[in-house]
Structure formats: C-alpha cells, structure tokens
C-alpha cells in the first residue's frame, strides 16, 4: 500500500513555502511526483 | 474493539525521565501513523509528537523538541514516548492517538493529524 | 504556527436549542479542519474531519462547514448528551494546533 501525503509530520519550513507557492493542482501533482522520486518512497505504506 | 491503553506515568522530579507506553489491539497498528498529544488538567489539547507507520517519519512540537523521543513496536502493537529532562510545565495527561490517514480525493494525498481512536490518557506530574 | 481561534469560548444553551460555534485560523488551511467533543474526564471524541465530513457513528445533528479561515459547527438540536467542550483542530500543516475550547453547558 502506497500513500502520498500532502502534508508532513517533521517541520519542513521550506516544503512548506513551496507547497504555498504552487499555483495550481497540477503544479502541486508535479512536485509531489518528483518529491517521490527523489526520496524512493520515502516509506510510505 | 479498537482501544488505545496509555501507562507509565506518575510523579517525578524534574530535570527526571519517564518512560509512557500505549498498547493498541483492534486494528492494524502497522497501517497507521500514532501521535502523542497532551492536556494540562481544565486547559485546552497540545500536539506533542506524531510518528509514521515504519517509523520513518518523525515529529515533535518545539516545547518537547530535543527531549522526547517517539517510538513504536509494530511486533507488539505499541507506542512509546521517552520523556528526558522533564520541566514543571510537561505536567499534562498524556493520550495516545491513531492517525485516520485521511484520503482528499480531490487533490489525490493523504493527510496527516486527523486522530479518531484515542486511549484515556496517563497522568504526568513534574514537581520537586 | 497556525493560531486556532474559537467562539464564543463558553456557551450557555438549552435542550434543543441550535448551537453555532465559530472557528478561525491565522491563515488559510483550505477544508482541513476537525472537529472534536469531549466530555469531563473522557478522551476527545472526533466529531468531524475535513470541515464536513462526519465521523462515522456521530449523529447527524451535528454538523460542520466553511473553508480557509473560518469554519462552524453547527448542533441542530442539542441534547443532553451532548453538554461538553469542543476543539477544532487544523491538520493543513505541521505542527497540528487547536482552537482553546468552547464549553457548552445547560442553561
């Protein structure tokens, strides 16, 4: 079971600001997908 | 039934430790993510600590940050809080909580920090 | 941090009454919002999540609405069970806050 979470439970100050200079849903989709990537999974579930 | 038991508290002295468990049965502890929040008696609820499923993702308010540690035993259905240098104002009830893993099926994420099965809570006081 | 803030913070109603308590945030968090009941000395109960959405088994007098920064919890007629205190808590971002409480108590 995999899970994408838009939201964190670390303090991530900059996530944050990118997550709240996003201007759109796609732009949002968009950086999740590369956030994944870049971390492996990150262990989601 | 889905229960959360809390234990481990009590009083202590500060600049002490104490060491609070939870033990979960009722669900599948391994599928969600567990948080530690608090309560001064007659006084609102605090976010302590949360941690993820695999322990991979940890994290704490700034009031206990470098103090408490959060940890889980997915083999024995536990949560665990370690509670180091411990200062008159820890003094709380402290609950255990499962995170509902929200889904928002409009943006596609799950989100954190939405608790819907709680224990009833293990007194903690810091006095000398 | 987000900065919860309810209304009012104590709340004087009768059986069947409808009860309305507000809830702001220091800025936007969009729908995710919860809301939680609790009871002298019980465990918080959740309410309602995502602004609207009832929790399962909550009656459905109970209600939840708004988005970005100010969000209602709406009881249509309170009964006696429900005498309590109410948090709303925002799950936008870390870390997670919640409002300072409103106690609703018997007229």
């Known amino acids: 079971k995999h899970k994408c979470f838009r939201n964190s439970l670390e303090n991530n100050e900059t996530l944050e600001s990118i997550m709240n200079t996003l201007e759109s849903e796609e732009d949002f989709r968009k950086y999740f997908y590369y956030l994944e990537g870049s971390k492996g999974g990150g262990g989601s579930k | 039934q889905v229960q959360l038991v809390e234990s481990g508290g009590g009083l202590v002295q500060p600049g002490r430790s104490l060491r609070l468990s939870c033990a979960a049965s009722?669900?599948?502890?391994?599928?969600?993510?567990m948080h530690w929040v608090r309560q001064v008696p007659g006084k609102g609820l605090e976010w302590v600590s949360g941690?993820?499923?695999?322990?991979?993702?940890?994290g704490y308010a700034d009031s206990v940050k470098g103090r408490f540690t959060i940890s889980r035993d997915n083999a024995k259905n536990s949560l665990f809080l370690q509670m180091n240098s411990l200062r008159a104002e820890d003094t709380a009830l402290y609950y255990c909580?499962?995170?509902?893993?929200?889904?928002?099926?409009?943006?596609?994420?799950?989100?954190?920090?939405?608790?819907?099965?709680w224990g009833q809570g293990t007194t903690v006081t810091v006095s000398s | 941090d987000i900065q919860m803030t309810q209304s009012p913070s104590f709340l004087s109603a009768s059986v069947g009454d409808r009860v309305t308590i507000t809830c702001w945030a220091s800025?936007?968090?969009?729908?995710?919002l919860a809301w939680y009941q609790q009871k002298p000395g019980k465990a918080p109960k959740l309410l309602i999540y995502?602004?609207?959405t009832l929790q399962s088994g909550v009656p459905s007098r109970f209600s939840g609405s708004g988005s970005g920064t100010e969000f209602t919890l709406t009881i249509s007629s309170l009964q006696p069970e429900d005498f309590a205190t109410y948090y709303c808590?925002?799950?936008?971002?870390?870390?997670?806050?919640f409002g300072q409480g409103t106690k609703v108590e018997i007229k």
């Open positions: 909580a499962k995170d509902i893993e929200y889904y928002d099926i409009l943006t596609g994420y799950y989100s954190y920090y939405i608790m819907d099965v």
């Open positions: 808590q925002q799950f936008n971002s870390y870390p997670p806050t």
């Open positions: 009722g669900f599948t502890f391994d599928d969600y993510a």
């Open positions: 995502a602004s609207s």
């Open positions: 941690i993820n499923w695999n322990s991979g993702s940890i």
């Open positions: 800025q936007g968090i969009s729908s995710y």
